[in-house]
């Protein structure tokens, strides 16, 4: 049995106002500093207590930052990405990608070409719907007796 983790990927626009100590987070990544395997993207590595990002509450460690003030962060050197943030001005708009873990459980072996796991809500919604239909049918059946 293998453990599997499935993720729900969502994107969000986060607008931050630079506080007294700045935006309040650290980043890793870049074409010269791949932090995630086969991905040269820019990731949030640390959120500082009481900084602008922490007080806003939406940005999380592990989030991937896709753009800053509309400027794409693809194919940037690490230092160039850092400089882009530092020169971003007072009001900063971030396009970020969150990865939410939605399932973590043991599974059997999957054959070649099988889907890499289904998010849990896609299983629960139909099951819940079927349960409701069955309950309704049962109540109708009892009324007819």
């Amino acid at each position: 049995m293998n453990g599997r983790v499935d993720y729900l990927v969502t994107e969000e626009e986060i607008n931050l106002t630079r506080g007294p100590s700045g935006l309040g987070f650290n980043i890793v990544g870049g074409t010269d500093q791949q932090y995630v395997s086969n991905d040269s993207g820019i990731y949030v590595s640390r959120i500082k207590e009481n900084g602008a990002a922490a007080l806003d509450g939406r940005l999380q460690e592990g989030d991937k930052i896709l753009s800053v003030n509309g400027q794409d962060l693809k194919n940037l050197l690490h230092q160039d990405a850092v400089d882009l943030f530092r020169n971003a001005g007072y009001a900063v708009s971030l396009r970020v990608q969150h990865r939410l873990q939605v399932q973590n459980g043991p599974i059997g072996h999957r054959g070649e070409g099988d889907p890499s796991g289904i998010p849990i809500f896609m299983v629960l919604v139909p099951v819940f719907a079927l349960t409701m239909v069955a309950a309704w049918a049962f109540m109708r059946y009892r009324q007819q007796l």
């Epitope: 650290n26 640390r46 850092v82 943030f85 530092r86």
Partner: nanobody, 128 residues
Framework: DVQLVESGGGLVQAGGSLRLSCAAS????????IGWFRQAPGKEREGVSC????????FYADSVKGRFTISRDNAKNTLYLQMNSLKPEDTAVYYC??????????????????????WGQGTQVTVS
């Protein structure tokens, strides 16, 4: 287990030199901003020198500029502090510290203690 271990401290005469090392284990220094801090008896811990994860940006406290040099060897997962022209006021316990990634807010102009998450146990430097 994340660990930083300092070495190279000791007793040296004024005007002498020492080279401190900080060996990291349990993580890869490549992605970490790292720095040297010191604490003299009865004083608060202060930033001495810091270097960002790429090695392109460094900070030195005014009191050590021109005498101390920070460097990193990512292949050896080690941070160094070359200390020349040592003075009695350099006597302190020297600590290395690390933080994942680089701050988006400023250059290394601050070397603040609260920027760093991982700390070594320190090595004593005494200048007579």
């Amino acid at each position: 287990d994340v660990q930083l271990v300092e070495s190279g401290g000791g007793l040296v005469q004024a005007g002498g030199s020492l080279r401190l090392s900080c060996a990291a284990s349990g993580f890869t220094l490549d992605y970490y901003g790292i720095g040297w801090f010191r604490q003299a008896p009865g004083k608060e811990r202060e930033g001495v020198s810091c270097i960002d994860s790429s090695g392109g940006s460094t900070f030195y406290a005014d009191s050590v500029k021109g005498r101390f040099t920070i460097s990193r060897d990512n292949a050896k997962n080690t941070l160094y502090l070359q200390m020349n022209s040592l003075k009695p006021e350099d006597t302190a316990v020297y600590y290395c510290a690390a933080v994942l990634g680089d701050s988006v807010d400023y250059g290394m102009g601050y070397c603040n203690l609260d920027e760093y998450d991982y700390w070594g146990q320190g090595t004593q430097v005494t200048v007579s």
